[in-house]
């Protein structure tokens, strides 16, 4: 299948380039120069301008009167100006503002709590399975298997800290080497980026909002995937992460530190622990092949226990089996020895909803998964709604300028690095990269933060989560200190290496362009967002896992042809965009491929047919259902009943927008179809009533 949908036969103009700063959008050339074309016809060669590969601009030459979909929307203030209000109006306005702030903080609180419960739900549903992934002996020899296990486990438990703590305990117990643990940590880094991608799906109701939110969320995914793509082979070949971290750990004589400060958890824990409490040791025990743990429930029942260490006398077949020669005797009939045992006495039960239900983990997990997703979605909608009403006119202008404006020349380049520090600091405060990036997603969606600014914030978040892990490692007991610190440092240096790869030079900021490309596709074909999520976080890792279990030969036998095809397609695209004349006429565009291999249109028809029943019986009772409905059926009319997904885009359906050259390594060699309708038509997607 061709790498991106609707790959046209547009040719670059070799004589002319449109230069532009990385973060800026070039002005669209004159429309008259362009030639429109349809899907499957051999259209005449189009003369268009080629953007430099470091540009984050889309490859769509839209009509000049149309706004760039990536430009931040202007949030108009329709209300009465402050100066025009009377005293009563001013007081009312002030209290409204205070009320909105309280509501915003309230919804934000429940949003973070729902993320925590979502993580618990995932652990209940897939935690034991996740633990069993770790007990696979092939991890030691197969870094690729380690990587996908890291992805799958983190996706299943919705927490990179859980999966890394399992890895730490396995390394401490010598069940895993640091070398084998590094790919798992890389995988955990990928897995943790699913949370904000799920959050982005909640903004599916508004195309332009969804475009930005989804791109803003997936910039994290692409950064992690690309970093692994480059750094895993480097690590396997050189073991640089292992060597650097080993030198650091050995050169310092660390003393056990304080526990990593729980800042956000202090506020959220009182609420979340009333919903459910988990015994996370069970997953670790399963990972460490503890047979008893497989029958244990993850739902914590007893919160107050008394542990009494005592020695009990046990019979042994002969005195040779004694635990210690000095602790051995016979009573003339049986041989006895002393064994140290720990008696656990349950004192007080936990106080959460599920403590007395005795439901299986899967049932509790499913209930919590549905409820947390509903709360998450509801809170997100309300946050977006409140922010939308607050961030209007002058307020929006000030905030947008503060966040998105660069430092004055010649220090403009420093802005991004400051954003990285801010992202790291904020993540350190909230103690979770998932929480920080998930909170960032709706802000990108409503247009408060640009993707260009969100990118360094996300990178900083990746660093922030590792500093928390380093602090936690320093607080771990003596036997686990070395391994946990080395793993935390591996995580840290992996992210630093990734930033050095994909941030300093604007040309290398591939994750931004890839995310924008995916944002464009997903805005047009909203089902593709779910498809992307399933493919990248479940199917690819599970396929690699399955092939790895079958053995190296099978993995290489299947993997090499797949990698070869991908490289072939990328090389072909490179030649098509850079020097198409060296290619035979047939290979100068993708028209030689059947439509289903180069366009999402036929697939869209299939999905539309498959979800046709949802269009007829679309549940539009509430905004939450509506969003899910819109995502499934991708239909403009399905939710008209409650004006939730009002979509005035049919008028533009017939129009076409000329395509620019298929830029190298850009997800943006896409036509009108992937670009989606113009945002002007999407301005009224907010629910008028809940």
């Amino acid at each position: 299948m061709a790498p991106w949908p609707e790959l046209g036969d547009a040719q670059p103009n070799p004589d002319k380039y449109l230069e532009g700063a990385a973060g800026q959008q070039p002005t669209a050339p004159d429309k008259s120069k362009e030639t429109n074309k349809t899907d499957n016809t051999e259209a005449p060669v189009t003369k268009i301008e080629l953007l430099p590969s470091y540009s984050t601009a889309t490859l769509i030459d839209e009509p000049t009167e149309v706004d760039d979909p990536w430009n931040l929307p202007t949030l108009q203030d329709s209300g009465i100006k402050w100066s025009e209000r009377d005293t009563k109006g001013k007081i009312l306005c002030f209290f409204q503002g205070i009320g909105r702030l309280i509501l915003l903080l309230g919804f934000l609180y429940f949003f973070v709590c729902s993320l925590d419960i979502l993580s618990s739900a995932f652990q209940l549903v897939g935690g034991k399975m996740a633990g069993q992934f770790f007990s696979n002996s092939s991890i030691m020899s197969n870094p690729l298997l380690g990587l996908v296990i890291g992805v799958l486990v983190t996706v299943l438990v919705q927490s990179s800290s859980t999966s890394t703590s399992i890895v730490v305990s396995m390394v401490s117990s010598s069940l895993l080497t640091v070398r084998a643990a590094i790919p798992i940590i890389m995988g955990a880094n990928i897995g943790t980026s699913i949370t904000n991608t799920i959050v982005a799906l909640m903004q599916v109701g508004d195309r332009s909002e969804f475009r930005r939110a989804f791109a803003g969320a997936t910039v994290h995914d692409f950064f992690n995937w690309l970093s692994v793509l480059v750094l895993l082979p480097v690590e396997v070949a050189t073991h640089y992460l292992e060597i650097i971290t080993q030198l650091i750990v050995e050169s310092f004589h660390f003393k056990n530190g304080e526990d990593a400060p729980d800042l956000l958890k202090v506020i959220t824990k009182p609420f979340t622990k009333l919903i459910v409490q988990l015994d996370k040791k069970v997953i670790s025990q399963i990972a460490m092949n503890d047979e008893k743990a497989k029958n244990k429930s993850l739902v914590k029942i007893w919160c107050k226990t008394f542990t009494n260490k005592t020695q009990i006398n046990v019979t042994v077949p002969s005195t040779a089996n004694c635990t210690s020669p000095s602790l051995c005797w016979t009573d003339g009939i049986q041989n006895w020895t002393m064994k140290n045992v720990t008696y656990k006495e349950n004192i007080a039960k936990c106080q959460h909803i599920f403590v007395n239900f005795h439901l299986p983990d899967l049932a509790v997990g499913t209930i919590l998964l549905i409820l947390s997703l509903l709360v998450l979605c509801g809170c997100l909608i309300m946050i977006v709604k409140i922010l939308g009403s607050v961030l209007k006119g002058q307020v929006a202008t000030v905030i947008k300028k503060t966040i998105n404006t660069d430092f004055p020349f010649p220090f403009a380049w420093l802005t991004g690095y400051l954003a990285i520090l801010v992202g790291a600091g904020m993540t350190f405060i909230v103690q979770s990269s998932s929480v920080f990036t998930s909170a960032l997603t709706p802000l990108i969606g409503i247009g408060v933060i640009t993707i260009e600014r969100a990118y360094p914030l996300t990178l900083g978040s990746n660093i922030g989560t590792t500093t928390t892990a380093i602090l936690a490692a320093l607080a771990s007991p003596g036997n686990a200190l070395r391994s946990s610190l080395q793993i935390a440092l591996c995580h840290f240096f992996f992210n630093i290496s990734g930033i050095l790869l994909w941030y300093p030079i604007p040309f290398t900021r591939l994750p931004i362009r890839m995310a924008k490309g995916l944002g464009n596709i997903s805005a047009k074909y909203r089902w593709f967002a779910v498809f992307y999520l399933i493919i990248f976080f479940f199917l690819i890792p599970l396929t690699v896992f399955g092939l790895s279990l079958a053995g190296w030969r099978v993995l290489v036998g299947v993997g090499v042809p797949v990698v070869f095809i991908i490289i072939l397609v990328l090389c072909l695209r490179l030649l098509q965009s850079r020097c198409p004349r060296v290619l035979p006429k047939k290979l100068q565009n993708w028209n030689f491929l059947p439509l289903w291999m180069r366009s999402l249109k036929p697939w869209d028809a299939v999905v539309s047919k498959f979800t046709g029943c949802f269009q007829m019986r679309c549940c539009c009772c509430c905004r939450v259902c509506c969003r899910a409905c819109c995502l499934l059926c991708d239909c403009p009319k399905c939710c008209r009943c409650s004006k939730c997904c009002e979509d005035l885009e049919e008028a533009q359906e017939g129009q076409d927008v000329p395509v620019k050259a298929p830029e190298t390594f850009d997800n943006i060699t896409i036509s009108r179809e992937a670009q989606g309708e113009v945002p002007a038509s999407d301005s009224k997607t907010e629910c008028t009533a809940l």
């Epitope: 006398n313 019979t315 016979t330 003339g332 009939i333």
Partner: antibody, heavy 120, light 107 residues
Framework: EVQLQQSGPELVKPGTSVKISCKTS????????IHWVKQSHGRSLEWIGG????????NYKQNFRGKAALTADKSSNTAYMELRSLTSEDSAVYYC?????????????WGQGTSVTVSS | DIVVTQSHKFMSTSLGDRVSITCTAS??????VAWYQQKPGHSPKLLIY???TRHTGVPERFTGSGSGTDFTLTITNVQSEDLADYFC?????????FGVGTKLELK
């Protein structure tokens, strides 16, 4: 009060058998092992064997296998030792003693002893 | 079988003296050793078990020590009621074996 009350002295002919009893009181019979010890010539002690009344499991010193047979009756809290094919060598004082099952506290209570005299 | 040896069949002492009765096992028995006191015409009575643990009701003047193969029963401030036979017993492996005994008597 812990008590191990043994049956009275026995005067028996060679080649015959004798059954000595050890009636216990003041403790849970089934939680203990009842051992039998031989003391001849008023000096050295020799372990014969032991029985776990709870399940009837026994063990004997090699040279007493076939010579001694240990039994226990849980209902009457009594242990028995039968000595077969008696010879003058078997003339001695026989003691029963209790040992707490699963503990290393040794033989903490003894019976008063039963004197067996083998004489024609 | 483990052979338990009590080298002194007789030991003479004076009232109020300190006396040490020794016992040697033919192989390592850890601390699985007990000491019994038997007065003439009476049944044996447990004094010390697990080499050094005093049985309930036993006066503090009786102390046990040792591990492995060499063990000692020490009586400080010998009283007239302490004049008796003393047996050591190993219970490391079956069969249980006793020493021949040491008779404590007045000088």
């Amino acid at each position: 009060e812990v008590q191990l009350q043994q049956s009275g002295p026995e005067l028996v002919k060679p080649g015959t058998s004798v059954k000595i009893s050890c009636k216990t009181s003041g403790f849970f019979f089934t939680e203990y092992i009842i051992h039998w010890v031989k003391q001849s010539h008023g000096r050295s002690l020799e372990w014969i064997g032991g029985i776990i009344p709870n399940n009837g499991v026994t063990n004997y010193k090699q040279n007493f296998r076939g010579k001694a047979a240990l039994t226990a009756d849980k209902s009457s809290n009594t242990a028995y030792m039968e000595l077969r094919s008696l010879t003058s060598e078997d003339s001695a004082v026989y003691y029963c003693a209790r040992w707490r099952n699963g503990y290393y506290s040794a033989m903490d209570s003894w019976g008063q002893g039963t004197s067996v005299t083998v004489s024609s | 079988d483990i052979v338990v040896t009590q080298s002194h069949k007789f030991m003479s002492t004076s009232l109020g003296d300190r006396v040490s009765i020794t016992c040697t096992a033919s192989q390592d028995v850890g601390t699985a050793v007990a000491w019994y006191q038997q007065k003439p015409g009476h049944s044996p009575k447990l004094l010390i078990y697990w080499a050094s643990t005093r049985h309930t009701g036993v006066p503090e003047r009786f102390t046990g020590s040792g591990s492995g193969t060499d063990f000692t029963l020490t009586i400080t401030n010998v009283q007239s009621e302490d004049l008796a036979d003393y047996f050591c017993q190993q219970y490391r492996t079956s069969p249980l074996t006793f020493g021949v005994g040491t008779k404590l008597e007045l000088k």
